[in-house]
């Protein structure tokens, strides 16, 4: 990664794992203070590729609850409300960082973990494979 | 939250902020080993609400690079390639965790931060406000 100039006011670390084990303050700073909470809440229902949200809960993880999107249909919803199977509803996935308690049940020791979550669905034109 | 049963093998913490300041191992464990990374890579182009990905880089953040989706059109793309402005392309947003160096430039001290990122776009029916 980028070499960060060391600040003389930094916490010291003589840890043999330095800098792979770091101190993290869990008092979360939220950068979304200006966000309108009504903004994207009902897209799951109004989308042409609507989805439901399913709970994935794990007390050994931070955050402990993650919501996974599952597309309601294989196809996409047309203006008349019927499903068009010539198009496909597909999940949009994102890799996110979570903290995993390690060792298990330890309240103050974690390991970073990457997990893939489905955030919502989008309607795509299918890839048609032509047989020669 | 729920009191996690303390494991006797846990690292000790006499920090006055305990348990809000924790140790985190940055050797990331990746749970997505079976995922095909190319699987959803072309949805941005094939979607009826296509998007472009813009790089957001910040050396004081971990991960330092985040990709933000921006919808290409206000409307949605029809089968003939034209844009239907009776429908709306909207970003699907996800709240994610990142680590922010705190104090700045410190290599081994971070604060958790929640940020809202746009992951992709979906096509929605607009909300029509009827004037009385």
């Amino acid at each position: 990664g980028i070499a960060i100039p060391r600040n003389s006011g930094c916490p010291n670390s003589e840890d043999k794992n330095f800098p792979r084990t770091v101190m993290v303050n869990l008092n979360i700073h939220n950068r979304n203070t200006s966000t309108n909470p009504k903004r994207s809440s009902d897209y799951y229902n109004r989308s042409t590729s609507p989805w439901n949200l399913h709970r994935n809960e794990d007390p050994e993880r931070y955050p402990s609850v993650i919501w996974e999107a599952k597309c309601r249909h294989l196809g996409c919803v047309k203006a008349d409300g019927n499903v068009d199977y010539h198009m496909n509803s597909v999940p949009i996935q994102q890799e996110i960082l979570v903290l995993r308690r390690e060792p298990r049940h330890c309240p103050n020791s974690f390991r970073l973990e990457k997990i893939l979550v489905s955030v919502g669905c989008t309607c795509v034109t299918p890839i048609v494979h032509h047989v020669a | 939250g729920i009191a996690i049963p303390r494991n006797s093998g846990c690292p000790n913490s006499e920090d006055k902020n305990f348990p809000r300041t924790v140790m985190v191992n940055l050797n990331i464990h990746n749970r997505n080993t079976s995922t095909n990374p190319k699987r959803s890579s072309d949805y941005y182009n094939r979607s009826t609400s296509p998007w472009n990905l813009h790089r957001n880089e910040d050396p004081e953040r971990y991960p330092s690079v985040i990709w933000e989706a921006k919808c290409r059109h206000l409307g949605c793309v029809k089968a003939d390639g034209n844009v239907d402005y009776h429908m709306n392309s909207v970003p699907i947003q996800q709240e994610i965790l990142v680590l922010r160096r705190e104090p700045r430039h410190c290599p081994n001290s971070f604060r958790l931060e929640k940020i809202l990122v746009s992951v992709g776009c979906t096509c929605v029916t607009p909300i029509v406000h009827h004037v009385a």
Partner: antibody
Framework: EVQLVESGGGLVQPGGSLRLSCAAS????????MLWVRQAPGKGLEWVAI????????YYPDSVKGRFTISRDNAKNSLYLQMNSLRAEDTAVYYC???????????????WGQGTLVTVSS | DIQMTQSPSSLSASVGDRVTITCRAS??????LSWFQQKPGKAPKSLIY???RLVDGVPSRFSGSGSGQDYSLTISSLQPEDFATYYC??????????FGQGTKLEIK
């Protein structure tokens, strides 16, 4: 000890507005999703609004969509429900409840407030 | 939306009896099911979560079981303070969370 205390209920005329508040203590409020659930006299339980920990996402059932707005102030450990265009069928005891998000919980709605009564009548 | 069908709607029993209340979901809810107890004029109180996990402080005579679509709450030996209304809640799929219609447990 986790505590949730609602306030702001009362008698209001149809078409009127009311703002409910819920003061939270005993847990890291900003780590939890919060909900409002209501119970009409002699009836069952119905959720009316939910807001994620950071406040960036909120959801409503069709019965209140466009009339009710949930919000939160994490600095004040407070949850709110702004209710506009009230109808007789909104008469109920309104409870605030907690759900897991960053912090873990005993499932959804593990802790509830004592409730505040909203009566919509002319 | 997932529908929750709770039965029976009312039940008469005596102190010391073993009683079982059931909830059926319209689809698999992956054991994301809670049970609540509500007494008149009071807020609901959480008893069981994740289908079979007892909330701290809840007496061990309460137990939950089930998976997939079918779940039950059992009180092994009824005590006078157990007469109340019981609700199940699915919290797997959202929105919305859905409650059962309630079971009123009365003294015979």
């Amino acid at each position: 000890e986790v505590q949730l205390v609602e306030s702001g209920g009362g008698l209001v005329q149809p078409g009127g507005s009311l703002r409910l508040s819920c003061a939270a203590s005993g847990f890291t409020f900003s780590d939890y999703t919060m909900l409002w659930v209501r119970q009409a006299p002699g009836k069952g339980l119905e959720w009316v609004a939910i807001i994620k920990s950071g406040g960036s996402y909120s959801y409503y059932p069709d019965s209140v969509k466009g009339r009710f707005t949930i919000s939160r102030d994490n600095a004040k450990n407070s949850l709110y429900l702004q209710m506009n265009s009230l109808r007789a069928e909104d008469t109920a005891v309104y409870y605030c409840a907690r759900d897991g998000d960053y912090g873990s919980s005993y499932g959804a709605m593990d802790y509830w407030g004592q409730g505040t009564l909203v009566t919509v009548s002319s | 939306d997932i529908q929750m069908t709770q039965s029976p709607s009312s039940l008469s029993a005596s102190v010391g009896d073993r009683v079982t209340i059931t909830c059926r979901a319209s689809q698999d809810i992956n054991s994301y099911l809670s049970w609540f107890q509500q007494k008149p004029g009071k807020a609901p109180k959480s008893l069981i979560y994740r289908a079979n996990r007892l909330v701290d402080g809840v007496p061990s005579r309460f137990s939950g079981s089930g998976s997939g679509q079918d779940y039950s709450l059992t009180i092994s030996s009824l005590q006078p303070e157990d007469f109340a209304t019981y609700y199940c809640l699915q919290y797997d799929a959202f929105p919305p969370y859905t409650f059962g219609q309630g079971t009123k447990l009365e003294i015979k």
